[in-house]
């Protein structure tokens, strides 16, 4: 392969092992067209805090508010939804928080944790007190509604108390719950009073109610699922990778791409060069070579490393990934010093992606 | 909504050259590749190419890259796939597809026939 | 490159029935599978994506499955209005490829 190359044809084959560069499914925040959300940046010890969304820098606007670890979105539109990260820089290192937004008329916000905790929500009475059923901990019902990434597992509980111990059944839509309503069915869990559903699909949406009776009463709590599908997406790249960085000559560097894709990404990374003097071709396009690219012959391909770097390895490195879907690049700069000059870590991130206008 | 609208019917002669648009609308074009597939009777669906409209990047199937130009306009939001040297073997229904191929134009019928 | 193989070119099948549609790759391919359903004298139409994820808008009896090289479109409660061809294809690299295609058949 040209070690130069025009940018009308870098896209190379990726040979590695199928991965997914993904994070783990991220919480997902739901809101109404108009409505407002506020969501809380849930890392520690951030002395500064910065927000993306789908990978580009998020500022404060007339609808966006930025306070603190509180990002507040005012009358959401369906243009809001995305994939949002807040990144917290301390003074040795960085974290960042991904989080969804999904600005549907269908209303959600998902709960699948786990049952470590209801066995205190079994309660048991003094025989003699006779008691209509009541619950016993509302506060793990407050969330009505709940959105669930499709595949994922639901969980709806409703503790409750009574004498004698009262038993609970569960609704559809206002109509009995059967096993054979949903593939794969369901599973009650008397002690923990829960519904769990697992590996939602969308036509598990509705209102679920559970009915919680003795021969003294009843009382019923209804939720209301909406299971968010998901679509596949062009690759993500982290903000602020990869970073500006200077050394000596003679020194080491490593730039760092984080990437995000469901579809198998190729990732390349790229630098400007010349060619007989000149930065550009005759059809105005700028030389290219591709340093590195994912591939079986290449270690972690979201890693460039430098050795023994000179002048010349001065300039712009940019990281291009793409899948089926489409593409997305970021760059950063690397700056060489002369051998006297100690390096730093530069702090202000990212060129503009559009490198290739 | 997502669509994608493809140039009409095409009776060409042997040797010549034809160029097929697809215009997208109802997304962002720049941020999605276009895929251009053919399907013949005998062959089934084949993936063509690509081209990535916001910096005109397109990849090639080996097959047809002495056959296809992928070219794309932004101010238009169109894609064109130029084809050469045509032979009757060319003679298949073309189709454009976005980025995920979640979304497909409606296909362009090429009939290479003297 | 990738060959994606649907060995069953034909299956028959009773409307309310369960139908799976199978397909191999000539090498691992993760889970970098889509399914396209495409009807006659029409467009594909994309049902699944990365092997088991469905398009919003499909219907929830057809289900994807597999990873690796094996992968599995299953219809559960076959309708009248899924007689097509279905395809898959692999999107984990160039030049993505697809499977010879498996016409449905209702009795």
């Known amino acids: 392969r040209p070690s130069f190359s025009l940018v009308e044809d870098t896209t190379l084959e990726p040979e590695e092992p199928p991965t997914k560069y993904q994070i783990s499914q991220p919480e997902v925040y739901v809101a109404a067209p108009g409505e407002s959300l506020e969501v809380r940046c849930l890392l520690k010890d951030a002395a500064v805090i910065s927000w993306t969304k789908d990978g580009v820098h998020l500022g404060p606007n007339n609808r966006t508010v930025l306070i603190g670890e509180y990002l507040q979105i005012k009358g959401a539109t369906p243009r809001d939804s995305g994939l949002y990260a807040c990144t917290a820089s301390r003074t040795v290192d960085s974290e960042t928080w991904y989080f969804m937004v999904n600005v549907t008329d269908a209303i959600s916000s998902g709960d699948d944790e786990d049952d470590t905790d209801g066995a205190e929500d079994f309660v048991s009475e003094n025989s003699n007190n006779k008691r209509a059923p009541y619950w016993t901990n509302t506060e793990k019902m407050e969330k009505r509604l709940h959105a669930v990434p499709a595949a994922n597992t639901v969980k709806f509980r409703c503790p409750a108390g009574g004498n004698p111990m009262p038993t609970m059944r569960w609704l559809k839509n206002g109509k009995e719950f059967k096993q054979e309503h949903r593939i794969g069915g369901y599973k009650v869990r008397n002690q923990h009073w829960s519904l769990i559903m697992e590996s939602v699909v969308p036509s598990d949406k509705g209102n679920y109610t559970c009915v919680v009776e003795n021969e003294y009463g009843s009382i019923n709590h209804t939720y209301h699922l909406d299971v968010v599908e998901r679509s596949p997406h062009r690759p993500i790249l982290q903000a602020g990778l990869p970073a500006n960085a200077s050394t000596v000559v003679g020194g080491d560097v490593e730039f760092v791409c984080k990437v995000y894709s469901d579809a198998q990404p190729h990732i390349q990374w790229i630098k400007h060069v010349e060619k007989n003097g000149s930065k550009y071709g005759p059809d105005g396009l700028p030389y290219l070579k591709v340093l590195k690219h994912s591939g079986i012959n290449s270690s972690n391909a979201e890693v460039l490393a430098l050795f023994n770097v000179t002048e010349a390895d001065a300039g712009e490195y940019i990281c291009k990934v793409s899948n089926y879907i489409g593409q997305a690049n970021q760059s950063a700069w690397l700056t060489v010093l002369p051998k006297q000059q100690a390096p730093g870590r530069e702090k202000e991130i990212t060129a503009s992606p559009d490198y290739l206008e | 909504q997502v669509q994608l609208q493809q140039s009409g019917a095409e009776l060409v002669k042997p040797g010549a050259s034809v160029k097929m648009s697809c215009k997208a609308s109802g997304y962002t074009f720049t941020i999605y590749n276009i895929h251009w597939v053919r399907q013949t009777p005998g062959q089934g669906l084949e993936w063509i190419g690509l081209?990535?409209?916001?910096?005109?990047?397109?990849s090639y199937n080996q097959k047809f890259k002495a056959k296809a130009t992928l070219t794309a306009d932004k101010s238009s939001s169109t894609a064109y796939m130029q084809l050469s040297s045509l032979t009757s073997e060319d003679s298949a229904v073309y189709y454009c597809a976005r980025g995920g191929f979640d979304y497909w134009g409606q296909g362009t019928t090429l009939t290479v026939s003297s | 490159n990738i060959v994606m193989t649907q060995s069953q070119k034909f299956m028959s099948t009773s409307v309310g029935d369960r139908v799976s549609v199978t397909c191999k790759a000539s090498q691992n391919v993760g889970t970098n599978v889509a399914w396209y359903q495409q009807k006659p004298g029409q467009s594909p139409k994309a049902l699944i994506y990365s092997a088991s994820y469905r398009y919003s808008g499909v219907p929830d009896r057809f289900t994807g499955s597999g990873s690796g090289t094996d992968f599995t479109l299953t219809i559960s409660g076959v309708q009248a209005e899924d007689l097509a061809d279905y395809y898959c294809q692999q999107h984990y690299n160039t030049p993505y490829t697809f499977g010879g295609g498996t016409k449905l058949e209702i009795k």
């Open positions: 081209i990535y409209p916001d910096n005109g990047d397109t």
